[in-house]
């Protein structure tokens, strides 16, 4: 169809805050459990801990983590999951500061991916009870779709 | 021409990942070779240690570099080499712990920037024989054309 | 109106750098003061610590600082002001080591966020007297108009 | 405190070669560069490059490649500057200055007291 | 290359007498310019970096300011110990460069 000049900018967009994050007894990991602040159309959907890709293509995808722990290095590791396997697709590391009055930083990437319907993205501490800092301003998630 | 739904998204867009670091002898920097990970449309081209530009315009860069190093702050340096002269587009910077252990930091920046034909754009760590990580999801680079 | 080819790519942009920071005495922040490296489109205008918004719309936006200083942690904070009231986007936060010659770390932090006509853009340091680098390719502050 | 001491003044024909040798103490030698800066008689001063000595990697000035070669001993606390195919416009100062070790985006604070070199036949 | 442009290349005044001289980079070096002091048959002396940090011992007379592309070092009153040559440099950028030098003399 012949675009508007309305249609032409409308990139789907979505920027979603944290709920809370938690830790499996049984797993080294913390997970965080997402909500949108933003969402400009229909082909993503939070859902828990994962987002589902519900219109494949190529997203720019972007994570910040506010970590508040004096374990020696932290980071987040954002996934995809779908068609029977896992793909780590980029990852933050940050050393920290072994005093816990310094240990405060925000570990910030980003990156261009061919996200697949049905796919779950997700963001994984690889830490268990990781101390994160759960401000919709120091951690966040966001999917712009190019 | 009356442009599609279809036609209307494709930005073009190039993920690259490493595929080795060097060192020049005669000069304090370490480069990064790369290989495409993700390529949309022909305006770019990774061609050995930089990448160059086909098609002229504006375009988000970015870059991040996964250090493993004790030299007390290491990071990345984004260039364009074009007409003639060197221009630094954005850098990166990381104080590193000085334990071997801790020392493991991601350092990740980006920005907009009018790039023209013939460009070669580069990522160089102002240090030989830098300590990085070239793991695709720690080490990567990228451009969407805008 | 029918797209042609070279219209449907023109998202508005503006990638700014600094011109100098400044403390009011009476506050504890740092202000930066920008000026355009790059432009396209009108719907943003540089107007000395703050960017207006002069086109509403969803945006990405992104800010790095170079901090050269001692002070446990530092970091910077994007904000909107308008229809009244003040409201926080994003934020980085860096630990800084304690030895000034270590004290070196860029802080890069983005998202995508909605912003609305007369909106007030700006970005501050929660420190008086911040000891920046205002090199343009460290320290600068980046919109574009999805 | 920190010093840089650099060796004596020479006197060399127009063609030879001269090193010259800037031995560092009061600081750790390894965590910072060391530049080297040039300045003719009655001129300004100019950039040469530096020697890290962390991994004893040169960085040149381009207008000095082929003409300086800047090398550093660790276990001496040295670094060194050798001039080959020298001419009478070469004929300066020549100091040494500490620099932090990510060259870019610090100052030179401490100097050498510099070193003569006259090219003369 | 950057080219950093010194203003005035010669300045007489006298013991308390407030100087100004000025740097201009041909492109934004944003605050990555010193200042150095040179007498005759000595070594410079880092007296301001990052455009207006002064360098430990440095008296209080001596400020610097600036950004981007022009550039500052200001005496606020001239001693006898002052009356030397004064360098800017820029170290944004490779390769680094100086300015061609201010001599100050007694008038």
């Known amino acids: 169809a012949v675009l508007t000049q309305k249609q032409k900018k409308q990139h789907s967009v979505l920027h979603l805050v944290p709920i809370n994050a938690t830790s499996k007894d049984d797993s080294d990991v913390t997970e965080v459990m997402w909500q949108p602040a933003l969402r400009r159309g229909r082909g993503l959907q939070a859902q828990g801990y994962g987002v589902r890709i519900q219109d494949a293509g190529v997203y720019l995808l972007y994570s910040q983590v506010l970590f508040q722990d004096v374990t020696f290095t932290m980071g987040q590791v954002v996934s995809r999951e779908g068609q029977g396997r896992q793909e780590t697709l980029f990852r933050c590391i940050r050393s920290m500061p072994s005093h816990p009055d310094r240990a405060y930083n925000s570990c910030y990437s980003a990156g261009v991916f061919h996200l697949h319907q049905g796919d779950i993205l997700s963001v994984i501490i690889p830490r268990a009870r990781a101390k994160l800092n759960l401000s919709p301003h120091g951690t966040f998630l966001g999917f712009v779709k190019l | 021409a009356v442009l599609t739904q279809k036609q209307k998204k494709q930005h073009s867009v190039l993920h690259l990942v490493p595929i080795n670091a060097t060192s020049k002898d005669d000069s304090d920097v370490t480069e990064v070779m790369w290989q495409p990970a993700l390529r949309r449309g022909r305006g770019l081209q990774a061609q050995g240690y930089g990448v160059r530009i086909q098609d002229a315009g504006v375009y988000l860069l970015y870059s991040q570099v996964l250090f493993q190093d004790v030299t007390f702050t290491m990071g990345q340096v984004v260039s364009r080499e074009g007409q003639g002269r060197q221009e630094t587009l954005f850098r990166c910077i990381r104080s590193m712990p000085s334990h071997p252990d801790r020392a493991y930091n991601s350092c990740y920046s980006a920005g907009v920037f009018h790039l023209h034909q013939g460009d070669i754009l580069s990522v160089i760590i102002p240090r030989a024989r830098a300590k990085l990580n070239l793991s695709p999801h720690g080490t990567f680079l990228g451009f969407v054309k805008l | 109106a029918v797209l042609t080819q070279k219209q449907k790519k023109q998202h508005s942009v503006l990638h700014l750098v600094p011109i100098n920071a400044t403390s009011k005495d009476d506050s504890d922040v740092t202000e930066v003061m920008w000026q355009p490296a790059l432009r396209r489109g009108r719907g943003l205008q540089a107007q000395g610590y703050g960017v207006r918004i002069q086109d509403a719309g969803v945006y990405l936006l992104y800010s790095q600082v170079l901090f050269q200083d001692v002070t446990f942690t530092m970091g910077q904070v994007v904000s909107r002001e308008g229809q009244g009231r003040q409201e926080t986007l994003f934020r980085c936060i860096r630990s800084m080591p304690s030895h000034p010659d270590r004290a070196y770390n860029s802080c890069y932090s983005a998202g995508v966020f909605h912003l609305h006509q007369g909106d007030i853009l700006s970005v501050i340091i929660p420190r008086a007297r911040a000891k920046l680098n205002l090199s343009p390719h460290g320290t600068f502050l980046g919109f574009v108009k999805l | 405190q920190v010093q840089l001491v650099q060796s004596g003044a020479e006197v060399k024909k127009p063609g030879a070669s001269v090193k010259v040798s800037c031995k560092a103490s009061?600081?750790?030698?390894?965590?910072?560069?060391m530049h080297w800066v040039r300045q003719a008689p009655g001129q300004g001063l100019e950039w040469m490059g530096y020697?890290?000595?962390?991994?004893?990697?040169?960085k040149y000035n381009e207008k000095f490649k082929g003409k300086a070669t800047m090398t550093s001993d660790t276990s001496a606390s040295t670094a060194y500057m050798e001039l080959s195919s020298l001419r009478s416009d070469d004929t300066a100062v020549y100091y040494c200055a500490r620099g932090l070790g990510y060259a870019l985006y610090y100052a030179m604070d401490y100097w050498g007291q510099g070193t003569t070199v006259t090219v003369s036949s | 290359d950057i080219v950093m442009t010194q203003s005035p290349s010669t300045l007489s005044a006298s013991v308390g007498d407030r100087v100004t001289i000025t740097c201009k980079a041909s492109?934004?070096?944003?605050?990555?310019v010193a200042w150095y002091q040179q007498k005759p048959g000595k070594a410079p002396k880092l007296l301001i970096s990052s455009a207006s940090n002064r360098d430990s011992g440095v008296p209080s007379r001596f400020s610097g300011s600036g950004s981007g592309t022009e550039f500052t070092l200001t005496i606020s009153s001239l001693q006898p110990d002052d009356f030397a040559t004064y360098f800017c440099?820029?170290?944004?950028?490779?390769?680094?460069?100086f300015g061609q030098g201010t001599k100050l003399e007694i008038k």
């Open positions: 020697i890290n000595p962390y991994n004893d990697a040169p």
């Open positions: 440099q820029q170290y944004n950028i490779y390769p680094f460069t």
């Open positions: 492109q934004n070096v944003g605050n990555n």
């Open positions: 009061g600081y750790t030698f390894t965590s910072y560069v």
